[in-house]
């Protein structure tokens, strides 16, 4: 899987998993959120060479093609596959409130 | 959505669908397909600025990041969402096959 | 510049529902509450809830809990608020207004240019 | 729910005057070294304004005439020298509790 375990301990030029810690106020402009300040993102990037991790059968008819077509345009791309919640805590006035945002963290990718 | 309806009749520089026709034999090396010849595969291509058809939270999160941050290299990416399957003729030996090929073809884009 | 530019008055029957749009641009959609407030003629200022558009977060003023519904559109920037079995007493003008952003609740810098809703049989 | 009482509920006052609106929270709205407390102006037909935010702070765009002091409960806006386009009705705003509440608005009347 193009997870943490793999991906932060490898240098890989191909799609994998990439380190982003986002800051809510400087990153984001969401002053409002009280804890946490900012949270492990992370996202996905890098190249889909033919069979890497591709996700549909799609994906891998166009990886091949693109291997065969090298002028094409059209590649599969890395993009997020496993995602897991955020949980908040913010003010309503005095009152504090805890809210769960979902799909706030990628955990693992895919090309697709 | 951004689907063909949508894409194939506007000039589109962002995430859409973009017309793909692969001939089997000659795009993908594959001569044991008998029918059809080819399929229109389609592809999702374009850029994924600010809240163009974001697909989950983080990608929201990370199209406003990219906005925030445009020297950030994290931004979401044009891919597919609704794919179709495909059927196709083949032999085995002089026994014709029909099969159903899940996720050949793609309907629609999103940003993820 | 910021700007806050809404739906066209409305009359409905008792009961009905109104959906009022908010259309924002000159500044990040995403990163600010959206308020709605209500003002009845002749009279005060009535907070009915928010929405944070990048999350679908809301807050809703239990005196209209049940009865509205806020949402966004973030593709276009638009903020709506739907008011379900109206009653004459919702004829009011209906405001949206951006929270200046420290906290969820807030005090609101830009306002839209509002939206009569007569409720009338 | 907190209360929000204005005091006067109207006024009448010439151009040049000192002008003070009183508001008064049926709790504290202190929090954190903050007052939640805001005041807008509202002419007729027209939506609600900004002027001050936090108890004190004036709005960017908004003459220096206007100023907000107060803590705790009670607040107040003053308006040093009134001009023909302060004429308005003024409401203050607390954000201390949920539900977000106004008080009654006060009408500000040439004499």
């Known amino acids: 899987a193009l997870d943490a375990a793999y991906c932060f301990r490898n240098v890989q030029d191909n799609c994998c998993l990439r380190p982003l810690y986002i800051d809510f106020k400087r990153d984001l402009g969401w002053k409002w959120i009280h804890e946490p300040k900012g949270y492990n993102a992370n996202f996905c990037a890098g190249a889909c060479p033919y069979l890497w991790s591709s996700d549909t059968q799609h994906s891998r008819v166009l990886s091949l093609y693109n291997t065969i077509n090298p002028e094409a345009s059209a590649s599969p791309c890395c993009v997020s596959q496993d995602l897991e919640p955020l949980t908040i805590l913010y003010y309503i006035g005095k009152t504090p409130k805890i809210e769960q945002l979902s799909n706030m963290i990628v955990k693992s990718c895919k090309c697709s | 959505a951004l689907d063909a309806a949508y894409c194939f009749r506007n000039v589109q520089d962002n995430c859409c669908l973009r017309p793909l026709y692969i001939d089997f034999k000659r795009d993908l090396g594959w001569k044991w397909i008998h029918e059809p010849k080819g399929y229109n595969a389609n592809f999702c291509a374009g850029a994924c600025p600010y809240l163009w058809s974001s697909d989950t939270q983080h990608s929201r999160v990370l199209s406003l990041y990219n906005t925030i941050n445009p020297e950030a290299s994290a931004s979401p990416c044009c891919v597919s969402q609704d794919l179709e399957p495909l059927t196709i003729l083949y032999y085995i030996g002089k026994t014709p096959k029909i099969e159903q090929l899940s996720n050949m073809i793609v309907k629609s884009c999103k940003c993820s | 510049q910021v700007q806050l530019v809404q739906s066209g008055a409305e009359v409905k029957k008792p009961g009905a529902s109104v959906k009022v749009s908010c259309k924002a641009s000159g500044y990040t959609f995403t990163s600010y509450w959206m308020n709605w407030v209500r003002q009845a003629p002749g009279q005060g200022l009535e907070w009915m809830g928010q929405?944070?558009?990048?999350?679908?977060?809301?807050n809703y003023n239990e005196m209209f809990e049940g009865r509205v519904t806020m949402t966004t559109d973030t593709s276009t920037s638009t903020a709506y608020m739907e008011l379900r079995s109206l009653r004459s007493d919702d004829t009011a003008v209906y405001y949206c207004a951006r929270g200046i952003g420290n906290y969820a609740l807030d005090a609101m810098d830009y306002w839209g240019q509002g939206t009569l809703v007569t409720v009338s049989s | 729910d907190i209360q929000m009482t204005q005091s006067p509920s109207s006024l009448s006052a010439s151009v040049g005057d000192r002008v003070t609106i009183t508001c008064r929270a049926s709790e504290s709205v202190d929090w954190y070294g903050n007052s939640f407390m805001h005041w807008y102006q509202q002419k007729p037909g027209k939506a609600p304004k900004l002027l001050i935010y936090?108890?004190?702070n004036l709005e960017s765009g908004v003459p220096s005439r206007f100023s907000g002091s107060g803590s705790g409960t009670d607040f107040t806006l003053t308006i040093s020298s009134l001009q023909p386009e302060d004429f308005a009705t003024y409401y203050c705003q607390q954000n201390a509790e949920d539900p977000l509440t106004f008080g009654g608005g006060t009408k500000v009347e040439i004499k």
């Open positions: 936090y108890a004190s």
């Open positions: 929405i944070f558009p990048a999350l679908g977060s809301t």
